[in-house]
């Protein structure tokens, strides 16, 4: 048994007569043989669930669900209740109605076995019938909505009449009907005004019925019509078996360059027309098991269940359904030497499904793990300016396909042929497994005998110690110019183009900072700023070279405060800024401000 609503509303007036009918509550059956029996909770409740008093005023007919006044609620009774309402004005009280045999403790009131009945209290007597508006004669103030379980026996779930109005205003004629399309499973009995289902409902065919209730009021010569929405929601049960969309039960995958733990290798999708079990219960009740194969496969792969609600069209309306993605995921990083082919099977079980048929599916994954060999081109040729500053990025080295690698830990090292000309350093980028070449020793750059630098690049896979090698030839170009005395260590300090370009800074490949002119479009990623090299800074990412010194690119790397219009980077730096952004690394501060329209260059041009 279950209530067709979780809450009911009616009005209560001072000194309403004992015996006044108030409203009907309705229960629907889960099985044909069930017979509802209603009982009221012992207490009346007020604001914030305050227990006010034992209920001495309202009774229920156990078999019909009719609530009525057992005794009149007079002023003194009302004041007694108000005193207990924690000082709040007592505008609404509620009762709990339980369905026997459901034995719920008085404290809890959860649908489907309990409903709340709210009474709006008016500190006046019942108004004169002639003063009631048609809306008040027809429907409660709060619009009802109904919940009906699918596949259950049909039954009565609502009674239109406002019982106190019918009781106290017998001369006013009120008629009701439901506006509904052809073939809908509801009927309104013209005599009793009871609304019932004609047959059991199927949620997978239709989940929501947006009906309209029409009330016609006859009072003397006057006839008025009032319409209100009458929504019915069909509640789901697990009556659909999982299926494969388009019959696809097998996925094939190749594991090659992406070998990192948590990499999704392949995905198979399962469709279920149901939306139960609910999300909290779903993973526990909708199980997936990687069937035992060889131990290596069990250790290397796991299956992740990702359910998602979707909507599908049924009979011209949309109903909710569930798609379950089953992802085959790497449980650990795979060595580049691994080389295997296997078939994995996953058993999916919708454990709540009762049939007909089985709620079990078998998913198949065909997986090939290919080995990776490390290759470098035979020779790299690069040039570097004699004016380059420390940490200037001058190029990249990268084993074949390194941009596609994940879970492969390649470290790069440089071996210099001339000990006094060891100018460059290399660091491995975590993003694309490349090696970034940067200037590490500017003194060596200035030595006349270091015009050509020869290195051996060695790439080593940390897990297997496999290696690849390449020659690196670096030509040193240009002549050295001493750093200006009044220039800051960081290019980012400058807030104007001309003062930016007259200085160098850490990370500058040319020995001069570069100005990046922004697009001037509010808070933008393309803000104006001074940078050692606009190729790498700012780019919204604090790279492995920039992490070595905050002065290189505080726009990407600063963890301090940013003043002015901006969007902070994740996890640091400036993602977007307003106007011009400049930074003071030693003070851990950046400022983003409107471009200064009073630029001296403008002053000159305007003269």
């Amino acid at each position: 048994l279950y209530f067709s609503r979780d809450a009911y509303w009616e009005k209560l007036y001072v000194d309403q007569a004992a015996g006044t009918p108030l409203l009907y509550v309705h229960a629907l059956r889960d099985a044909p043989e069930e017979v509802p029996s209603f009982r009221l909770g012992q207490h009346l409740y007020g604001t914030y669930r305050t227990r006010l008093h034992e209920n001495n005023w309202i009774c229920i007919q156990e078999d019909t669900g009719l609530l009525y006044l057992n005794r009149s609620l007079d002023h003194s009774s009302w004041e007694k209740l108000s005193v207990r309402n924690r000082g709040f004005p007592l505008l609404t009280v509620y009762l709990k109605v339980f369905l026997s045999p459901t034995s719920l403790r008085e404290g809890e009131c959860q649908w489907p076995g309990c409903a709340r009945v709210y009474f709006s209290f008016f500190n006046t007597s019942f108004p004169a019938c002639s003063s009631l508006k048609p809306r008040e004669l027809c429907f409660p103030e709060t619009r009802p909505s109904f919940r009906i379980r699918e596949n259950r026996p049909p039954g009565t779930f609502h009674q239109f009449r406002l019982l106190p109005v019918q009781f106290l205003c017998p001369n006013i004629s009120v008629a009701y009907r439901l506006l509904e399309g052809e073939g809908l499973p509801f009927r309104c009995a013209p005599d009793s005004l009871e609304v019932s289902t004609r047959w059991a409902l199927d949620r997978e065919q239709r989940e929501k019925y947006e009906l309209v209730a029409v009330c016609t009021v006859h009072a003397g010569a006057r006839e008025e019509v009032v319409m209100v929405p009458f929504p019915v929601t069909v509640y789901d049960e697990d009556d659909s078996a999982p299926t494969f969309p388009a019959g696809v039960d097998t996925a094939s995958a190749v594991v090659e360059f992406k070998r990192k733990e948590d990499t999704v290798v392949a995905t198979l999708r399962v469709f279920d027309a149901d939306v139960v079990p609910a999300s909290g219960e779903l993973v526990r009740r909708y199980t997936s098991t990687l069937l035992p194969g060889d131990t290596w496969a069990q250790q290397t792969f796991r299956v992740e269940h990702w359910p998602n609600e979707t909507s599908v069209q049924a009979n011209g309306s949309f109903v909710r359904a569930t798609v379950h993605d089953y992802r085959l995921v790497l449980n650990r990083n795979l060595s580049i030497s691994e080389n295997r082919t296997m078939q994995l099977a996953v058993l999916v079980n919708d454990s709540d499904f009762q049939g007909p048929g089985a709620g079990v599916l078998l998913l198949h994954f065909n997986v090939s793990v290919l080995p990776v060999s490390l290759h470098l081109p035979s020779t790299y040729s690069l040039s570097v300016s004699r004016r380059a500053r420390r940490f200037a990025q001058i190029g990249k080295v990268c084993v074949e396909n390194c941009q596609a690698f994940s879970g492969i830990n390649v470290q790069y090292k440089l071996h210099s042929s001339g000990a006094n000309c060891s100018t460059l350093g290399v660091v491995t980028s975590a993003e694309d497994t490349s090696g970034i070449l940067f200037v590490n020793d500017t003194k060596a750059l200035r030595r006349p005998k270091c015009a050509e630098l020869h290195y051996m690049v060695v790439a080593t896979d940390q897990q297997t110690s496999r290696q690849a090698q390449a020659q690196l030839l670096v030509t040193v170009e240009g002549s050295y110019v001493a750093e200006e005395a009044g220039c800051p260590l960081s290019c980012a300090v400058s807030k104007r183009r001309l003062e930016c370009e007259e200085c160098g800074g850490l990370g500058s490949p040319t020995g001069r900072c570069e100005w990046r002119q922004g697009d001037g479009k509010g808070i933008t990623r393309n803000f104006s700023t001074c940078s050692p090299s606009t190729k790498t800074c700012p780019d919204g990412h604090c790279d492995v070279v920039e992490t070595q010194d905050i002065n290189i690119c505080p726009q990407d790397c600063l963890r301090g405060s940013i003043v002015g219009g901006h969007e902070p980077g994740e996890p640091r730096g400036i993602k977007a800024g307003y106007g011009t952004c400049n930074c003071f690394p030693e003070e851990e501060k950046c400022f983003c401000e409107p471009e200064d329209i009073q630029d001296p260059l403008c002053d000159e041009l305007c003269r």
């Epitope: 009044g486 220039c487 003062e499 200085c503 009073q598 630029d599 002053d603």
Partner: antibody
Amino acid sequence: QVTLKESGPVLVKPTETLTLTCTVSGFSLSSARMGVSWIRQPPGKALEWLAHIFSTDEKSYSTSLKSRLSISKDTSLSQVVLIMTNMDPVDTATYYCARRTTMAPYYYYYGMDVWGHGTTVTVSS
Amino acid sequence: AIQMTQSPASLSASVGDRVTITCRASQGIRNDLGWYQQKPGKAPKLLISAASSLQSGVPSRFSGSGSGTDFTLTISSLQPEDFATYYCLQDYKYPWTFGQGTKVEIK
């Protein structure tokens, strides 16, 4: 040692043009972040900034006097020249030139760290 | 132009006193503000740049603070040679502007 020295006429007639020269030593006018400002101070009154020339040769002027001022430099002579037209008795003041540069240790911020002694200009018929 | 308002216009103090001079900008100037000391018949001298950075060779009894619109110059213990006029200068935006000065006199 860094020094700045102002030179120019002591007396100027109304409507005439004033030309002041600032000769610097101990630093180059083309060095990065080195600029020279002109500032004046009427007798018993506050300082008033007039104009500035940057190492990059860009210039900036006081808004109220912009139409009457012109600043320039000759790097080879280590001189900065200020020309002020249409002189008036209210322009009677001591005129200073000052070096504006970035401050150690981080060279983030600027200050007028070295000033000339000033030259007094009287405007009278 | 940004207005710089200094207060007080003048003050009388004794040797050893703690003296505070404030400078308020008509709009935010970050910390692009310098403090200058001028003695009669002499050129001004830079004390503090960037609102709080003490110039080399300036006694540590001078200190500066503030950011945005409100700035303070503090002399923790006034010495005989500190009797002078003090000016603030903003060089955040053109045209650069001085405050009207605060004259510190012997009480």
